[in-house]
Interface confidence: low
């Protein structure tokens, strides 16, 4: 297992609709054809997997149908979007990239993106 540098923004503010997007960029030491991207959430020293996708270079990322993540890839960059976020989901979102094929296997883990989510104020009742 060899180390690989992964860069991601330090802070991202989710939209009022609970959507946050950020770029995860990795320094590929070789010509990987199969890449796995995993988003981990760290909160209170607990790390949980948010979503993961394996893709062939040049193809779209495919997350599970019920995943809250979507994404696109371009070269060594992955554009990740997480949807359905609420204030309680505020935390550090870590991008992990694995170059699965061909060997040797490379693993890179970013420093994390702090995603802040603010629940929108409920609209006041209207008379009309």
């Amino acid at each position: 297992c060899k180390a690989m540098h992964v860069a991601q923004p330090a802070v991202v503010l989710a939209s009022s609709r609970g959507i946050a997007s950020f770029v995860c960029e990795y320094a590929s030491p070789g010509k990987a054809t199969e890449v796995r991207v995993t988003v981990l959430r760290q909160a209170d020293s607990q790390v949980t997997e948010v979503c993961a996708a394996t893709y062939m270079m040049g193809n779209e990322l495919t997350f599970l149908d019920d995943s809250i993540c979507t994404g696109t890839s371009s070269g060594n960059q992955v554009n990740l979007t997480i949807q359905g976020l609420r204030a309680m989901d505020t935390g550090l979102y870590i991008c992990k990239v694995e170059l699965m094929y061909p060997p040797p296997y490379y693993l890179g883990i970013g420093n994390g993106t702090q995603i802040y989510v603010i629940d929108p104020e409920p609209c006041p009742d209207s008379d009309f």
């Epitope: 297992c1 054809t33 199969e34 796995r36 993961a52 996708a53 394996t54 062939m56 992990k96 699965m100 094929y101 061909p102 060997p103 040797p104 693993l107």
Partner: antibody
Amino acid sequence: QLQLQESGPGLVKPSETLSLTCTVSGGSISSSSYYWGWIRQPPGKGLEWIGSIYYSGSTYYNPSLKSRVTISVDTSKNQFSLELSSVAAADTAVYYCARVSYYYGSGSYYFDYWGQGTLVTVSS
Amino acid sequence: DIQMTQSPSSLSASVGDRVTITCRASQGIRNDLGWYQQKPGKAPKRLIYAASSLQSGVPSRFSGSGSGTEFTLTISSLQPEDFATYYCQQLNSYPWTFGQGTKVEIK
């Protein structure tokens, strides 16, 4: 509970091709978290890793066997298979299939589930 | 290829004994090492992964340690069901290789 079951002929003639299938039950072979592998053990000897496959079809082979080995996967049947061509008496062994897991804590792989093994004898 | 050398090849011990098996790698493998137990006619059983992490369901008398090139498997108090052959395996680089095995016999 995940289970792996090897199947195939127990006797193969020299110079022919050994073909084995591993059927996975209790879990999906298409999970992106795992590899699937073959290991063999000649009678009274140690273990030898033959090769591994990812559900996408990407393969990793032991160079000592690479010219004779083909590992394939059939996600629709939840199976993966081993073919070893031009067999000789030295290929007589118990053949195991296994799941390869990935430990996120350290980035290590490990074999966590094994089939019970099937003895393949190469003899005329 | 990375060569894995286990020592001793075999040992005799009594129930209750503390047993230590060593595995050496021909080059550094970080902590990418697993330990397996095998009984006659059975498939290997997972014991330790990542050099020192105990597989769930494995008794706590088993422990693993080491990093780099030297690793040990320790059985703190040998039980009757522990008499078996133990293998180490490196999963750091291809081809993944096993040690030759250590047979633990009853004294």
